[in-house]
C-alpha cells in the first residue's frame, strides 16, 4: 500500500519560519498534491499549496514558497509573521492524489521540544485516508 | 455547503452553439474540477468533459471531443460549458457536478447544479 | 448502448431488499472504483456510494455497495416508498479514458 510522509521543520534563523516536506512512497504516476493545515483537505483544514506536476503550483498565505524536491516529494516553506502564522502545535497535512488510484493523506506537527533547525526524520506518517 | 447554481434553459437553432454557465458558491474552486454531464429526456447520464479551474486542465469524452469547450474563471467561481455544431439529439439536461478526480483521484461527482435544459429545434 | 450494464427495473414491496446489478469489463469496473447515483424524478442525481462500498455522510446505511470482479452491485433493504428512483452505476474507464455510465435502473416500491 502506498504511504505519504510529512516532516515539519522550524527554521532555525527565523523562529516563526516553518518547512512542510512530504514524500509519496509508491508506484503510481502522482496527478495532484495538496498541502493544508489545521486538518486534512476537506475534512476542516484549510489548503496551503496545490502542485500540480505539469501545470505548476498555486499557493495562498502564509505559503511562502511551494516547489517539487522530486517526482514524489514536496516541500513548502511558510512565511512566519502576522495573524496566519503557523506555530508550534500546528497540524500540516499531505494529499497525494494518483489518478484514477485514489489519494494518500498523512498528517504531521513539529516534533515536541524540538530546538529550531532540527526535526523528526521523515518516517511515514499515519494514513489518514486513502480514497 | 457548496452550491453549484446553473444558468437558464435555452433554445437554440440546429447548427448554432450553446453556452451554459455554472457558479460555485459557499466554497472556492480549490483543487477540486467541474464536470459536465448531460441527459436526454427519458434518457441516462452521459459524461462530456471536465476541468480542473485551478490550472485550467480539461478533459473531454472522446465522443464529444472537437464539438465542446469547457472553461472556467477562476476569480468568480465559474464554469462554462459550450456545445457547437448543435442537432436534435442534444435537446438534454446539461448538469454541472463537482469532481474530485484531480483531488482525490477518483472520478467521482459529490455535488450537482440544478440542471439546464437546452431544446435544439427548428 | 451504454458501457455499463444494469436492468431497466427492479421492484419490491416496503420493508423488502432489492439489489441492482451493474457489469461492466476489465478496462473500467474491473480496475476502478464505482460509484452509484440515486435519481429522484425531476431532480438532479445525488452520490449514494462511492469507492464501491461507502456512504457520503447522510446516507442511510440502507444503501451498501459491493464491488466483485467486473460486476458490481447495490443493495437497498428495508425499502420504501422514497427510494424509488432511478439508480445509475459509473466508474472511470481506461480505454475510453473517461467516465461511464450504466444506462440506470428504475426502482419502484410496489403498493
Known amino acids: 500500500t502506498p504511504e505519504v510522509w510529512v516532516q515539519v521543520r522550524m527554521e532555525a534563523t527565523e523562529l516563526s519560519s516553518f518547512t512542510i516536506r512530504c514524500g509519496f512512497l509508491g508506484s503510481g504516476s502522482i496527478s495532484l498534491v495538496t498541502v493544508s493545515w489545521g486538518g486534512p483537505n476537506g475534512a476542516g483544514g484549510t489548503t496551503l499549496a496545490v502542485l500540480h506536476p505539469e501545470r505548476g503550483i498555486r499557493q495562498w498565505a502564509p505559503a511562502r514558497q511551494a516547489r517539487w524536491e522530486t517526482q514524489s516529494s514536496i516541500s513548502l516553506i511558510l512565511e512566519g509573521s502576522g495573524a496566519s502564522s503557523p506555530c508550534a502545535n500546528t497540524t500540516f497535512c499531505c494529499k497525494f492524489a494518483s489518478f484514477p488510484e485514489g489519494s494518500w493523506e498523512a498528517c504531521g506537527s513539529l516534533p515536541p521540544s524540538s530546538d529550531p533547525g532540527l526535526s523528526a526524520p521523515p518516517t511515514p506518517a499515519p494514513i489518514l485516508r486513502a480514497d | 455547503q457548496v452550491q453549484l447554481v446553473q444558468s437558464g434553459a435555452e433554445v437554440k437553432k440546429p447548427g448554432s452553439s450553446v453556452k451554459v454557465s455554472c457558479k460555485a458558491s459557499g466554497g472556492t474552486f480549490n483543487n477540486y474540477g467541474i464536470s459536465w454531464v448531460r441527459q436526454a429526456p427519458g434518457k441516462g447520464l452521459e459524461w462530456m468533459g471536465q476541468?480542473?479551474?485551478?490550472?485550467?486542465?480539461?478533459k473531454y469524452a472522446q465522443k464529444f471531443q472537437g464539438r465542446v469547450t469547457i472553461a472556467a474563471d477562476e476569480p468568480t467561481s465559474t464554469a462554462y460549458m459550450e456545445l457547437g455544431s448543435l442537432r436534435s439529439e442534444d435537446t438534454a439536461i446539461y448538469y454541472c457536478a463537482r469532481d474530485r478526480m484531480a483531488a482525490d483521484g477518483m472520478a467521482v461527482f459529490d455535488y450537482w447544479g440544478q440542471g439546464t435544459l437546452v431544446t435544439v429545434s427548428s | 448502448q451504454s458501457v455499463l450494464t444494469q436492468p431497466p427495473s427492479v421492484s419490491g414491496t416496503p420493508g423488502q431488499k432489492v439489489i441492482i446489478s451493474c457489469s461492466g469489463s476489465?478496462?473500467?469496473?474491473?480496475?476502478?472504483?464505482v460509484f452509484w447515483y440515486q435519481q429522484l424524478p425531476g431532480t438532479a442525481p445525488k452520490l449514494l456510494i462511492y469507492?464501491?462500498?461507502e456512504r457520503p455522510s447522510g446516507v442511510p446505511d440502507r444503501f451498501s455497495g459491493s464491488k466483485s470482479g467486473t460486476s458490481a452491485s447495490l443493495a437497498v433493504s428495508g425499502l420504501r416508498s422514497e427510494d424509488e428512483a432511478d439508480y445509475y452505476c459509473s466508474s472511470w474507464d481506461a480505454a475510453l479514458n473517461g467516465v461511464v455510465f450504466g444506462g440506470g435502473t428504475k426502482l419502484t416500491v410496489l403498493g
Open positions: 476541468i480542473i479551474p485551478l490550472f485550467g486542465t480539461t
Open positions: 476489465s478496462s473500467n469496473i474491473g480496475r476502478h472504483f
Open positions: 469507492k464501491n462500498d
